[in-house]
C-alpha cells in the first residue's frame, strides 16, 4: 500500500497548529471498517493517534491531536497537531493498513521567531574616544538556535571580540546574548542581526554611541510628576522640556533618553541630528519642537515590559536630567462565567462558579455579589495568570451552596484604569438551570 507524505519537513510555529499530511489511495468499495491507521513517533514508537475497528481511538499524545475524520474515506490520513511545542519536534510515522499495509515518516520542524534585540552598553557614561565598551545584543524566546551577525554603521561586518551565548528558557526556547567588545571612535553605530535559520527571519538592533564632552553646571529639565498611563498597544508621550537660552542651536544639544534603572539607551539626539531609537525601534522625538525646548519622547505600541522609569538627560553647555514614570495598563475582557456541575442541580447542592477575565494589566481586583448586591466573601479563590505578553488572565472561583434560585455576579476591576467588567450567572427552576450574562465594562469613578 502506497502511503504519501511530504518530503520536506513541516515547519510549525510554537503555539500554533500544524498538519502532518499523509495520504493513501483507497480501492473501490473501501470502507473505514477495514482501516487501521496509526500515527506514532518514529524513534520511540510511542503511539500518537489511531483509528481502528471503524472508529477514532483518539489522541494518545497529550490530547493535542486529531484526524480529519470526514476526509479519511477519501484517503486523507493527515494528523492535526494543536498548540505545537518545542518538544514535538521530530519524525512522525503514518502507518496505514487495509489488507496490505504501508508507512511513511514526516518530519516536524518547530520554530519560534526571535524578539527584536535589546541593546545594552557598559560602561554607559562619561565615555571618551578610545574607551573600550561592551555592547550586549539580547534577543529572546526563539527556536531553533539563532545566528548572530554584527555590523558597523557602514554595514561592514564586525567579527573580532564577539562572544555569543544561547540560554534555553523554561519552555526550551532560546535567549541569545551576543557581546561585542569595541574601542570607541569619535562616534559610531553598532548593529546586531539575529537570524532564525529555519524561518529565515532577521531581527535587527542597533546602538549609536557618541562620547560626551565634560558638562558643567545645570539645565532645568521638567517632566510630569504623575506617572504617564498608557494602554498596551497604544502610543504614549513621555513629556520632557527644557528652557533654551537665546541663540540656542540644535548643534549644541545632547539629548539622551534612557531607562532609569539599567541606564539602557532608549533614544538620543546628538551632533545636531536624531540618532534614532535604541529601544526596539519604537521611539521617536518631536524633532520640529526640539528647538523650542520640547524633548518629549513618543513610545509606540506600548508593551507591559515598557513599564518603569525613563530618564530625560539634556546637555547643552550645562546639563540636567529628570525621570518620568510610565504606568502600563490594559482593560480586562468581559468575564466569562462557568458553572460546575451544571445539570441536575437541586437547592442545597454545592457548586463552583468560575469567573474568568482575560488580558488585563496590572493585576485585577475581583469582587463577588449576590442578586441583591450584597458582597460574597467566603470560599473565593482568585488566581492571576500572566500570559506570554505579561498580561494577566484572572480566574476567580466561588464555591456556594445553592438556594431556591439565585444570581451570582463577579466584578473585575482594573485598579489603574478604574475600569469594571461585570459577569453574572443566574440559577433558577426545578431542576435548576443556569444562564450566564455578561455586561460591557464601564469606568468606575
Amino acid at each position: 500500500l502506497e502511503v504519501q507524505v511530504p518530503e520536506d519537513p513541516v515547519v510549525a510555529l510554537v503555539g500554533t497548529d500544524a498538519t502532518l499530511r499523509c495520504s493513501f489511495s483507497p480501492e473501490p468499495g473501501f470502507s473505514l471498517a477495514q482501516l487501521n491507521l496509526i500515527w506514532q513517533l518514529t524513534d520511540t514508537k510511542q503511539l500518537v493517534h489511531s483509528f481502528t475497528e471503524g472508529r477514532d481511538q483518539g489522541s494518545a499524545y497529550a490530547n493535542r491531536t486529531a484526524l480529519f475524520l470526514d476526509l479519511l474515506a477519501q484517503g486523507n490520513a493527515s494528523l492535526r497537531l494543536q498548540r505545537v511545542r518545542v518538544a514535538d519536534e521530530g519524525s512522525f510515522t503514518c502507518f496505514v493498513s487495509i489488507r496490505d499495509f504501508g508507512s511513511a515518516a514526516v518530519s516536524l520542524q518547530v520554530a519560534a521567531p526571535y524578539s527584536k534585540p535589546s541593546m545594552t552598553l557598559e560602561p554607559n557614561k562619561d565615555l571618551r574616544p578610545g574607551d573600550t565598551v561592551t555592547i550586549t545584543c539580547s534577543s529572546y524566546r526563539g527556536y531553533p538556535e539563532a545566528e548572530v551577525f554584527w555590523q558597523d554603521g557602514q554595514g561592514a561586518p564586525l567579527t573580532g571580540n564577539v562572544t555569543t551565548s544561547q540560554m534555553a528558557n523554561e519552555q526550551g526556547l532560546f535567549d541569545v546574548h551576543s557581546v561585542l567588545r569595541v574601542v570607541l571612535g569619535a562616534n559610531g553605530t553598532y548593529s546586531c542581526l539575529v537570524r532564525n535559520p529555519v524561518l529565515q527571519q532577521d531581527a535587527h538592533g542597533s546602538i549609536t554611541i557618541t562620547p560626551q564632552r565634560s558638562p558643567t553646571g545645570a539645565v532645568e529639565v521638567q517632566v510630569p510628576e504623575d506617572p504617564v498611563v498608557a494602554l498596551v498597544g497604544t502610543d504614549a508621550t513621555l513629556r520632557c522640556s527644557f528652557s533654551p537660552e537665546p541663540g540656542f542651536s540644535l548643534a549644541q544639544l545632547n539629548l539622551i533618553w534612557q531607562l532609569t534603572d539599567t541606564k539602557q539607551l532608549v533614544h538620543s539626539f546628538t551632533e545636531g541630528r536624531d540618532q534614532g531609537s535604541a529601544y526596539a525601534n519604537r521611539t521617536a522625538l518631536f524633532l520640529d519642537l526640539l528647538a523650542q525646548g520640547n524633548a518629549s519622547l513618543r513610545l509606540q505600541r506600548v508593551r507591559v515590559a515598557d513599564e518603569g522609569s525613563f530618564t530625560c538627560f539634556v546637555s547643552i553647555r550645562d546639563f540636567g536630567s529628570a525621570a518620568v514614570s510610565l504606568q502600563v495598563a490594559a482593560p480586562y475582557s468581559k468575564p466569562s462565567m462557568t458553572l460546575e456541575p451544571n445539570k441536575d442541580l437541586r437547592p442545597g447542592d454545592t457548586v463552583t462558579i468560575t469567573c474568568s477575565s482575560y488580558r488585563g494589566y496590572p493585576e485585577a481586583e475581583v469582587f463577588w455579589q449576590d442578586g441583591q448586591g450584597a458582597p460574597l466573601t467566603g470560599n473565593v479563590t482568585t488566581s492571576q495568570m500572566a500570559n506570554e505578553q505579561g498580561l494577566f488572565d484572572v480566574h476567580s472561583v466561588l464555591r456556594v451552596v445553592l438556594g431556591a434560585n439565585g444570581t451570582y455576579s463577579c466584578l473585575v476591576r482594573n485598579p489603574v484604569l478604574q475600569q469594571d467588567a461585570h459577569g453574572s450567572v443566574t440559577i433558577t427552576g426545578q431542576p435548576m438551570t443556569f444562564a450566564a450574562a455578561h455586561h460591557h465594562h464601564h469606568h468606575h469613578h
Partner: antibody, heavy 117, light 111 residues
Framework: EVKLVESGGGLVQPGGSLKLSCAAS????????MSWVRQTPEKRLEWVAS???????YYPDSMKGRFTISRDNARNILYLQMSSLKSEDTAMYYC???????????WGQGTLVTVSA | DIVLTQSPASLAVSLGQRATISCRAS??????????MHWYQQKPGQPPKLLIY???NLESGVPARFSGSGSGTDFTLNIHPVEEEDAATYYC?????????FGGGTKLEIK
C-alpha cells in the same frame, strides 16, 4: 590563564544574609556569562544563578527572590547576594564561567557557606 | 524540571579497562542541532572540571580516553583505558531548559 577566586563565605544564622564575591582574571570578563553553582554537603550540585549583564539574569525558581547575582565589569568581580538564608543553603558555592550553551567551563575553588543557629 | 539519573552510583574498574557511566534524562535534552548534555569530573577537595560539552565534544586539554555519546534522553560517558588518576566522581548536567540540573554523580574507583 583563567582564574576565579571566591570569597565572603562563612557561618551565618538562619534568616541572615551574606554577600559572596568572585574575582576573575585571565580573560575578558565582560564578554562572558558568569554563574554560581553550589555543592551541598551530600555532594549534590545545584545551579544557583547566571548573569549576562547588569539587567539580564537567570535563576531557578527555588532561588528567585532570595538570591541576587550581579557583576562589576570595571573591577572584574561577580557577586551573589543571599538573604533569608536557610539551613538547606549550606553548601560550597562555586563561581563559574559559562560556556556558550550554559555549560560551566571554568570553576573557582569555592567558598563555604554554613547556615546554622 | 528535567531530572538526570546517573547509574551506577559507584563502580570499580581495573586499570586499563573501560568505565561506562550512564545518564538518563526525564525528557529529551536534544534538538535537531545539539544535545545539551555535559560531563564533569570532580576529585576530592577540588571543584568540578569540564570534560565533555554538548554530549560528545572533548574540552580542550582533556585526554582523548574520555568520550561522550548519546542523544535524546540517554547519554554515556566512556573512559578507556582507565588510568589511576581517573579515580573521581563524575557528574552529568543538562542545559536544554531552565532550570539547569545535574545528575547525582557516579564515583569511579580504580582496582
Amino acid at each position: 590563564e583563567v582564574k576565579l577566586v571566591e570569597s565572603g563565605g562563612g557561618l551565618v544564622q538562619p534568616g541572615g544574609s551574606l554577600k559572596l564575591s568572585c574575582a576573575a582574571s585571565g580573560f575578558t570578563f565582560s564578554s562572558y556569562i558568569m554563574s554560581w553553582v553550589r555543592q551541598t554537603p551530600e555532594k549534590r550540585l545545584e545551579w544557583v544563578a547566571s548573569i549576562v549583564s547588569s539587567n539580564i539574569t537567570y535563576y531557578p525558581d527555588s532561588m528567585k527572590g532570595r538570591f541576587t547575582i550581579s557583576r562589576d565589569n570595571a573591577r572584574n568581580i561577580l557577586y551573589l547576594q543571599m538573604s533569608s538564608l536557610k539551613s538547606e543553603d549550606t553548601a560550597m558555592y562555586y563561581c563559574a564561567r559559562s560556556g556558550t550553551r550554559a555549560w560551566f567551563a571554568y570553576w573557582g575553588q569555592g567558598t563555604l557557606v554554613t547556615v546554622s543557629a | 524540571d528535567i531530572v538526570l539519573t546517573q547509574s551506577p552510583a559507584s563502580l570499580a574498574v581495573s586499570l586499563g579497562q573501560r568505565a561506562t557511566i550512564s545518564c538518563r534524562a526525564s525528557k529529551s535534552v536534544s534538538t535537531s542541532a545539539y544535545s545539551y548534555m555535559h560531563w564533569y569530573q570532580q576529585k576530592p577537595g577540588q571543584p568540578p572540571k569540564l570534560l565533555i560539552y554538548l554530549a560528545s565534544n572533548l574540552e580542550s586539554g582533556v585526554p582523548a580516553r574520555f568520550s561522550g555519546s548519546g542523544s535524546g534522553t540517554d547519554f554515556t560517558l566512556n573512559i578507556h583505558p582507565v588510568e589511576e588518576e581517573d579515580a573521581a566522581t563524575y557528574y552529568c548536567q543538562h542545559s536544554r531548559e531552565l532550570p539547569y540540573t545535574f545528575g547525582g554523580g557516579t564515583k569511579l574507583e580504580i582496582k
